[in-house]
């Protein structure tokens, strides 16, 4: 009879993470008696991974009876497979021995490679507000995926971004990668409403990428115009004085008046007005008593925005001069008000 | 069902020969090493031949020269003859299948008595 | 040749009682050993194989256990039809030995 050989007849087996990997093995004698045994790798440091004779491999199981002494399929089957699990497994028949069964003959091996879907991308913006015309980065990190080819892509509001720069790590071989991408933008007013999107697409996903998506609402500072603006007199000796804060984002705002350079009142803006583009207006009234001043008044409306130093604006009241509209005119949207009348 | 049924047993003088048979069924015969094992009276089991899936054979000292194991696949059946027979040699023979993968045996005859006596 | 000794060679116990027999080998023999059954005027039965494999259908109140040259056979809870001769044998060279037995009798 001629002597055994061991034939391993897939030379690679391609998985998917979390499904079963089947690793076939045939000897083509049943001499010598003899244990079969599966390893990862060769030489002195390889894995065992099953050995018919004893031992506990959970995750192992026999195609075939191995119990029995005419069987020669000693294929095995690894469940829930990992990318942690691809490497190059050997089956090997041993003869019977002591004090140890003796290796006899391997087989040419299988190279079992893991295809493992990436995570979800996680795209993250600067961690302090920018203004517009500044530009900003964006991070997108995916991790665990095998094989190592991907694809990344950048987009802002549906258009596809070209100022990125990407790294997929390790460079060399290992059982599952990460990719890490850098992104340039410019910030505009009108980013409010803004998506930057990043996609990854790889051989596992069959044709539908995975996306991170990070809302410019968090990254994005609109700073507010004002307008401060004398109405018509509204009752004898007494002005309406109106601040227009336009076009700002985020909402968190204070306005402060004074009179004079005195602090008349601090108010927090609440009631505000959406603009389509997703900044705010607020209006804030400031009802001045004329004729408890003798000469002219300075009203300053001051504004703290999102934390931000303070900006403000500044009308002279004429005491003496019979009440009027005056003031600068700036283009308004939508206006809100919030009245409070101090005397 | 895996059977394993003994014939040839029997009365012989000294210096004597007989042939024992094996007939196997409910298993692919060619595919296992089988062995004849035996039992004097009141004492232990000795074993006393295998043959080879590829008809190699070995024997203890006690019957070397004297028995031959043989087998015939395509009628699934195991010999043993048995020459120059000894009054040591009295005993029940059963066949056994060497059927575990290393070869321990599993399945066992219902044994067939030899005696060797003048 | 390997030489495979019992002990104890006669043992009395009682029903349910665990018991354990042991077999030591001349020579290490891996865990190439197997533990027989036999009753007065029948066969032998199969019941461990590599020191420590139940063989197909034989309950798991039996159990083997050892390496090199010392092992064990457990019973852990005998019932009557277990009072029978009990052998090891070792099988990892020829020729194949056997140890005497060891009869276990009810108290």
């Known amino acids: 009879e001629e002597e055994l050989q061991v034939i391993q007849p897939d030379k690679s087996v391609l998985v998917a993470a979390g499904e079963t990997a089947t690793l076939r093995c045939t000897a083509t004698s049943l001499i010598p008696v003899g244990p079969i045994q599966w390893f990862r790798g060769a030489g002195p440091g390889r894995e065992l991974i099953y050995n018919q004779k004893e031992g506990h491999f959970p995750r192992v199981t026999t195609v075939s009876d191995l119990t029995k002494r005419n069987n020669m399929d000693f294929s095995i089957r690894i469940g829930n497979i990992t990318p942690a699990d691809a490497g190059t497994y050997y089956c090997v028949k041993f003869r019977k021995g002591s004090p140890d069964d003796v290796e006899f003959k391997s087989g040419a091996g299988t190279e079992l490679s893991v295809r493992a879907k990436p995570s979800a991308p996680v795209v993250s913006g600067p961690a302090a507000r920018a203004t517009p015309q500044h530009t900003v980065s964006f991070t997108c990190e995916s991790h665990g995926f095998s094989p190592r080819d991907i694809t990344l892509k950048w987009f802002k509001n549906g258009n596809e971004l070209s100022d990125f720069q990407t790294n997929v790590d390790p460079v060399g071989e290992s059982v599952s990668y990460s990719i890490h991408s850098t992104a340039k933008v410019v910030l505009t007013r009108e980013d409010v409403h803004s998506q930057v999107i990043c996609e990854v697409a790889h051989v596992t996903l069959q044709g539908d990428p995975l996306r991170g998506t990070a809302n410019l609402s968090e990254t994005i500072r609109v700073p507010p115009t004002l307008e401060v603006t004398q109405q018509p007199v509204r009752a004898e000796n007494q002005v309406n004085v109106t601040c227009q804060v336009r076009k700002f984002y985020p909402q968190r705002l204070q306005l402060t008046w004074l009179e004079n350079g005195n602090v008349s009142r601090t108010e927090t803006a609440s009631t505000v007005t959406e603009n389509k583009d997703g900044t705010y207006n607020w209006m804030s009234w400031l009802l001045v008593n004329v004729s408890a001043h003798r000469d002219d008044v300075k009203l300053t409306c001051q504004v703290e925005h999102d934390g931000q130093p303070a900006v403000s604006k500044s009308h002279d009241l004429k005491v003496s001069a019979h009440p009027k509209e005056q003031g600068s005119n700036t283009a308004a949207e939508n206006t809100g008000s919030n009245e409070r009348n101090i005397y | 069902e895996v059977q394993l049924v003994e014939s040839g047993g029997g009365l012989v003088q000294p210096g004597g020969s007989l042939r024992l048979s094996c007939a196997a069924s409910g298993f692919t015969f060619s595919s296992y090493d089988m062995h004849w094992v035996r039992q004097a009276t009141g004492k232990g089991l000795e074993w006393v031949s295998v043959i080879g899936i590829a008809g190699d054979t070995y024997y203890p000292g006690s019957v070397k020269g004297r028995f031959t194991i043989s087998r015939e696949n395509a009628k699934n059946s195991l010999y043993l003859q048995m020459n120059s027979l000894r009054v040591g040699d009295t005993a029940v023979y059963y066949c056994?299948?060497?059927?575990?993968?290393?070869?321990?045996?599993?399945?066992w005859g219902q044994g067939t008595m030899v005696t060797v006596s003048s | 040749d390997i030489q495979m000794t019992q002990s104890p060679s006669s043992l009395s116990a009682s029903i349910g009682d665990k018991v354990t027999i042991t077999c030591r080998a001349s020579q290490d023999i891996n865990n190439y050993l197997a533990w027989f059954q036999q009753k007065p005027g029948k066969a032998p039965k199969s019941l461990i194989y590599?020191?420590?494999s139940l063989q197909s259908g034989v309950p798991s109140k039996f159990s083997g256990s050892g390496s090199g040259t010392d092992f064990t056979l457990t019973i852990s809870s005998l019932q009557p039809e277990d009072f029978a001769t009990y052998y090891c044998?070792?099988?990892?060279?020829?020729?194949?030995?056997f140890g005497q037995g060891t009869k276990l009798e009810i108290k």
């Open positions: 044998q070792q099988y990892v060279s020829y020729p194949y030995t």
């Open positions: 590599t020191a420590s």
């Open positions: 056994a299948r060497g059927g575990s993968w290393d070869d321990a045996f599993d399945i």
